[in-house]
Amino acid sequence: KFSKQSWGLENEALIVRCPRQGKPSYTVDWYYSQTNKSIPTQERNRVFASGQLLKFLPAAVADSGIYTCIVRSPTFNRTGYANVTIYKKQSDCNVPDYLMYSTVSGSEKNSKIYCPTIDLYNWTAPLEWFKNCQALQGSRYRAHKSFLVIDNVMTEDAGDYTCKFIHNENGANYSVTATRSFTVKDEQGFSLFPVIGAPAQNEIKEVEIGKNANLTCSACFGKGTQFLAAVLWQLNGTKITDFGEPRIQQEEGQNQSFSNGLACLDMVLRIADVKEEDLLLQYDCLALNLHGLRRHTVRLSRKNPIDHHS
């Protein structure tokens, strides 16, 4: 469950984040799983660990393999796995499927293409963008922060988009490229006040102390591609990241689905090793878009183990 797939190209920088997260003060140890050999933290090494990040500067095909990260706190250890694959650079223009990040779809109103994984790197604007290997030129294309905006999107804009940027580490520069497909939705969409499908308002979820629990916040926002729609969890009215409980994590990235033609998002809240104090918290599922915000609150209750009488 706490394993993450990462990939990159040889001679490019690759930075991987430990799938298990903790407070910045916690130490994170990295190991190469096949040999159980510790990854050094000294930056003079080509491959080194830097807290939650594992850095390949630059990556080599031989770096491929499974890396283990252990987040250590005074009270617990958490283990995650990063499955890293480094590929040889392709001589031709085609980007193979295994190098592609998730497909994004756009419409006339919303045509943002985010550069995948860029937030892990120390980069400076502007980004370079390519479509099907051709550098993008013309006033319709605007590189803005970490994404590309295409004005007046047309069906012909569908294709594979590659962002290229430079990662800087202690004065040394490394190239990074990432590619994802962009599809154009030619449909007349509409947007509604958010509708939360799950959880039900004031739902009580039964959990077992010491076990893991998942809460899913799922909401729909209208039809077609939605602009500025989001679902998120809060604990007692506090953002998950600010709450400071590493056992409780929001799943990275929102899953988008189209249910009966409706655009829906869901966000999973994972609670590891449920404790008594978790039963005292209010878990707020928030769904918001330009129309407004809707909140459903969940509380946890202890599931009584079934007595087995002889």
């Epitope: 006040f193 308002q201 809060q234 009215g237 506090t238 953002k239 209010q282 707020d284 928030l286 918001l288 129309h291 407004g292 915000l293 809707r294 909140r295 459903h296 609150t297």
Partner: nanobody
Amino acid sequence: ESGGGSVQAGGSLRLSCAASGFTYRRACMGWFRQAPGKEREGVAAIYTSGGMTFYDASVRGRFTISQDNAKNTVYLQMNSLKPEDTATYYCAAGGGDYCATNARFFNYWGQGTQVTVSS
């Protein structure tokens, strides 16, 4: 509410609303306005836990709603004011299960402050 007054078109005003008597955290705070002979209309709203903001199309880009959690206070910064912004402005609060510029989501209302914009 406070901060109302008279101003020339193109000018700015900042309205304040200090909240008390209910749970400010996890609430929805909003600004509404009513011009003489017209219906009350929503202007802006903010969800106090996280500061998510919502605006009516007529003021988006000109008005900004913000908050100071330490003071349980919400502000409405009004720039590029127009004569049609003239109205009594009301601060309102709701429980937070919904947050938008819709009056039915609010159950606490202030007394109102007058804003007059002359051309």
